[in-house]
């Protein structure tokens, strides 16, 4: 069977996961006043063939999973990575302790897909 | 994905990697007329702390990084996966054997970078 | 001429570990991945696991998950494969197999019969 | 997975007679189908790629045919050092399974 050669079988397809970062606990908690930490989530999951709708996969993803197909030594997976990113806003202190609001682009995972 | 290989390698930062496909390769050669195949191309290599420049790396990649670095058995770290794709036009034959000049969205890897 | 010479036949008791060496010559080794195969008595072929040579990933069988270990010294061309918690269904011919892109296996070793007994 | 399967799983042939040995495929493998030559205490050896292409050191006796599921190897005029096991293997759809093989026996 397939489960005798493939190990990444017993893996999850690709999708997003949920996750909270604490900014005290990435030691940030000097500088950045608010929030306390937010919503990240994260990628993960396996790109493997056939890709799905749900996979939203590019056309390179599609052809680079077939050449892993006949390649699995030289050609990796495509990657499960965001496709859809959203900005936080953050209040924190500049170099001059002045207190800054500023809107950091590309912060929380919306979606994920196969690239 | 990163855990079907051998962590212990040290192993080549994220770029991209030269890859020529052949449709004749995928089983195509019956219904592409031209080309015979193109550079694809593909990306491979790690994210690892700390992403440099060249990594073109997001927001969120950089925070994931971090949170990899606490928390390894938990959250991946980010994948190395395009960030620009070109096009490329192919002449085809479609259902009713008529022949057609058709551009294909995101099928050459220009760029990688770590998400 | 490409060569892949082996090391020579072992004899183990259940429990331990084999190491078997695969030495390559008259290619660039690190253009090619080195696949392990093994057959049994009466048995066909059976394939273990891989390495890229070049970069150093690895797969392997999920039979065999856990207890295989491929490894590479690029300084020395040869590809290992280590096979642990070693049991009498292990006694079998093991060979080493080069692949290139695309290709099928065009290159085999000599082979090294590993005999597991009490 | 891409099953192989072979027939006979046994074959008996005098020398100088012609052989053939079959192999399918559970689906289309294209034309990525290589035949092994494996003798008693020998390494196998690769007999025949890409379907039909034969490889070096294999004398034009040996002949490879098909594509997609159904490939067949043809041995005209046996000679005695022909006489071993015959393995398929399929090189299109990791993961690249050989077939049981087929043995191919002096009469």
């Known amino acids: 069977s397939a489960s005798d050669y493939n190990s990444s079988e017993l893996k999850t397809a690709c999708r997003k996961h949920e996750l909270y970062v604490s900014f005290q606990d990435l030691g940030w908690q000097d500088w950045i006043i608010a929030p306390k930490g937010y919503a990240a989530n994260y990628c993960d999951g396996e790109c493997s063939f056939p890709l799905n709708a749900h996979m939203n996969a590019t056309n390179h993803a599609i052809v680079q999973t077939l050449v892993h197909l006949m390649n699995p030594e030289y050609v990796p997976k495509p990657c499960c990575a965001p496709t859809k990113l959203n900005a936080i806003s953050v209040l924190y202190f500049d170099d001059n302790s002045n207190v800054i609001l500023k809107k950091y682009r590309n912060m929380v995972v919306r979606a994920c897909g196969c690239h | 994905s990163a855990s079907d290989y051998n962590s212990s390698e040290l192993k080549t930062a994220c770029r991209k990697h030269e890859l020529y496909v052949s449709f004749q390769d995928l089983g195509w050669q019956d219904w592409i007329i031209a080309p015979k195949g193109y550079a694809a191309n593909y990306c491979d290599g790690e994210c690892s702390f700390p992403l440099n420049a060249h990594m073109n790396a997001t927001n969120h990649a950089i925070v994931q990084t971090l949170v990899h670095l606490m928390n390894p058995e938990y959250v991946p770290k980010p994948c190395c996966a395009p960030t620009k794709l070109n096009a490329i036009s192919v002449l085809y034959f479609d259902d009713n054997s008529n022949v057609i000049l058709k551009k294909y969205r995101n099928m050459v890897v220009r760029a990688c970078g770590c998400h | 001429q490409v060569h892949l010479v082996q090391s020579g036949a072992e004899v183990k008791k259940p429990g331990a570990s084999v190491k078997v060496s695969c030495k390559t010559s008259?290619?660039?080794?690190?253009?090619?991945?080195i696949h392990w195969v093994r057959q049994a008595p009466g048995q066909g072929l059976e394939w273990m696991g891989w390495?890229?040579?070049?970069?150093?990933?690895?797969e392997y069988s999920e039979k065999f998950q856990g207890r295989v270990t491929i490894t590479r010294d690029t300084s020395a061309s040869t590809v290992y494969m280590d096979l642990s918690s070693l049991r009498s269904g292990d006694t079998a011919v093991y060979y080493c197999?080069?692949?290139?892109?695309?290709?099928?296996?065009?290159?085999w070793g000599q082979g090294t019969l590993v005999t597991v007994s009490s | 997975e891409i099953v192989m399967t072979q027939s006979p799983a046994t074959l008996s042939v005098s020398p100088g007679e012609r052989a053939t040995l079959s192999c399918r495929a559970s689906?289309?493998?294209?034309?990525?189908l290589a035949w092994y030559q494996h003798q008693p205490g020998q390494a196998p050896r690769l007999l025949i790629y890409?379907?039909?292409t034969r490889a070096t050191g294999f004398p034009p006796r040996f002949s490879g045919s098909g594509s997609g599921t159904d490939f067949t190897l043809t041995i005209n005029s046996l000679q005695s050092e022909d006489f071993a096991v015959y393995y398929c293997?399929?090189?299109?759809?990791?993961?690249?399974?050989f077939g049981p093989g087929t043995k191919l026996d002096i009469t």
């Open positions: 197999a080069r692949r290139g892109f695309g290709e099928p296996f065009d290159q």
């Open positions: 008259g290619y660039t080794f690190t253009t090619y991945a």
């Open positions: 390495i890229n040579a070049g970069n150093g990933r690895t």
């Open positions: 689906q289309s493998v294209s034309s990525n």
């Open positions: 890409g379907a039909s």
């Open positions: 293997q399929q090189y299109n759809n990791w993961p690249f399974i």
